[in-house]
């Protein structure tokens, strides 16, 4: 595959990575398998900075990232070490909340409407961002 | 490497008090939800008691509801139960464990109690 | 509280075989449970998770299924390192309960 130059229709480019934001709601294990289909994963917050892009670009709304600890520890979607690298819980979370009754706990991460992370039933339907790297090799062949 | 270490086990008397310990390392420790679980000896595993991250959440089994106090000092990386009032019947390997379906555990301390 | 009950609740199996062992709650707890195995002198061990997602590191001779009130335990080619007592806990609410155990010895 070639190496992706410039970020897709739709997609909007920040420090060498496109973004892509959903206007409707999906569970996380779906718009988890949204985004690789679109040959992306859902957003990997690194830095304070990529935090504050994706903030203003989703506003004061509920949107799944790509951070979940459905497998017991927490875990990025795309291998980033959770243990050593940018955080931005709301206090007192995550909580894995079971007050919901919905059965188990809260195993997905989301941004709040202060842009603040919290932990959430994983079946709830949030916007969700997608994420893919330019320096990525794309899966498309390259033009002749 | 993800570690627990329990620590604060041994004899005591009924109506007597100890408090265990657990160790935690190789995690964030303030974004786990942990557990105590223990085990009477020759018996199966019993749930005791589970605290959230922040310590928002803290949940008993009614056996031990009123004599147990589960905390933690995330700044120390650790977690505790006050046991106060023990009984016969509390004696057992006491276990942490970490999230609710115990992903990784410790290696038990043993607490007896007995006259 | 959710019960949970285990069968059987000892069985004898030679090496290679494929056991199963159930266990059912007493009211529906989704996908909400955990397999542990655990030797004598030893900690548990996690093996399965979500009913039947495999832990990390665990072989994949180890299945589970199941949802809402019944669930089962595969091991496939049983091998001397598998004799031990397995649990079954349920964590889609508290109080979390553990089932009574089923132990899996040589015939």
């Known amino acids: 595959g070639s190496e992706r130059t410039c970020c897709p229709v739709n997609w909007v480019e920040h420090e060498r990575s496109c973004y892509w934001f959903s206007r409707s709601g999906k569970a996380w294990a779906d718009a988890d398998n949204y985004c690789r289909l679109e040959d992306a994963h859902l957003v990997v917050v690194t830095s304070w900075e990529e935090q504050k892009f994706v903030q203003h670009h989703i506003g004061p709304v509920n949107t799944w990232m790509g951070l979940h600890d459905q497998n017991g520890p927490w875990k990025w979607v795309d291998g980033t070490d959770y243990e050593t690298g940018f955080k931005n819980w709301r206090p007192e979370q995550p909580d894995d909340w079971y007050g919901h009754g919905l059965g188990g706990g809260e195993d997905c991460a989301h941004f709040t409407d202060d842009g603040r992370w919290n932990d959430d039933v994983c079946q709830r339907p949030y916007r969700w961002v997608c994420e893919t790297e330019l320096d990525k090799a794309s899966q498309e062949p390259p033009l002749l | 490497e993800v570690q627990l270490v329990e620590s604060g086990g041994g004899l005591v008397k009924p109506g007597g008090s100890l408090r265990l310990s657990c160790a935690a390392s190789?995690?964030?420790?303030?974004?786990?939800?942990m557990n105590w679980v223990r085990q009477a000896p020759g018996k199966g595993l019993e749930w005791v008691s589970s605290i959230s991250g922040s310590s928002s959440y803290i949940y008993y089994a009614d056996s031990v509801k009123g004599r147990f106090t589960i905390s933690r000092d995330n700044a120390k990386n650790s977690l505790y139960l006050q046991m106060n009032s023990l009984r016969a019947e509390d004696t057992a390997v006491y276990y942490c464990?970490?999230?609710?379906?115990?992903?990784?555990w410790g290696q038990g301390t043993l607490v007896t109690v007995s006259s | 509280d959710i019960q949970m009950t285990q069968s059987p609740s000892s069985l004898s199996a030679s090496v290679g075989d494929r056991v199963t062992i159930t266990c059912r709650a007493s009211?529906?707890?989704?996908?909400?449970l955990v397999w542990f195995q655990q030797k004598p002198g030893k900690a548990p061990k996690s093996l399965i998770y979500?009913?039947?997602s495999l832990q990390s590191g665990v072989p994949s001779k180890f299945s589970g299924s199941g949802s809402g009130t019944d669930f089962t335990l595969t091991i496939s080619n049983l091998q001397p390192e598998d004799f031990a007592t397995y649990y079954c806990q349920q964590y889609n609410s508290y109080p979390f309960t553990f089932g009574p155990g089923t132990k899996v010895d040589i015939k």
């Open positions: 009211q529906g707890i989704s996908k909400y």
């Open positions: 979500a009913a039947s």
């Open positions: 464990a970490r999230v609710s379906w115990a992903d990784c």
């Open positions: 190789g995690f964030t420790f303030s974004s786990y939800t």
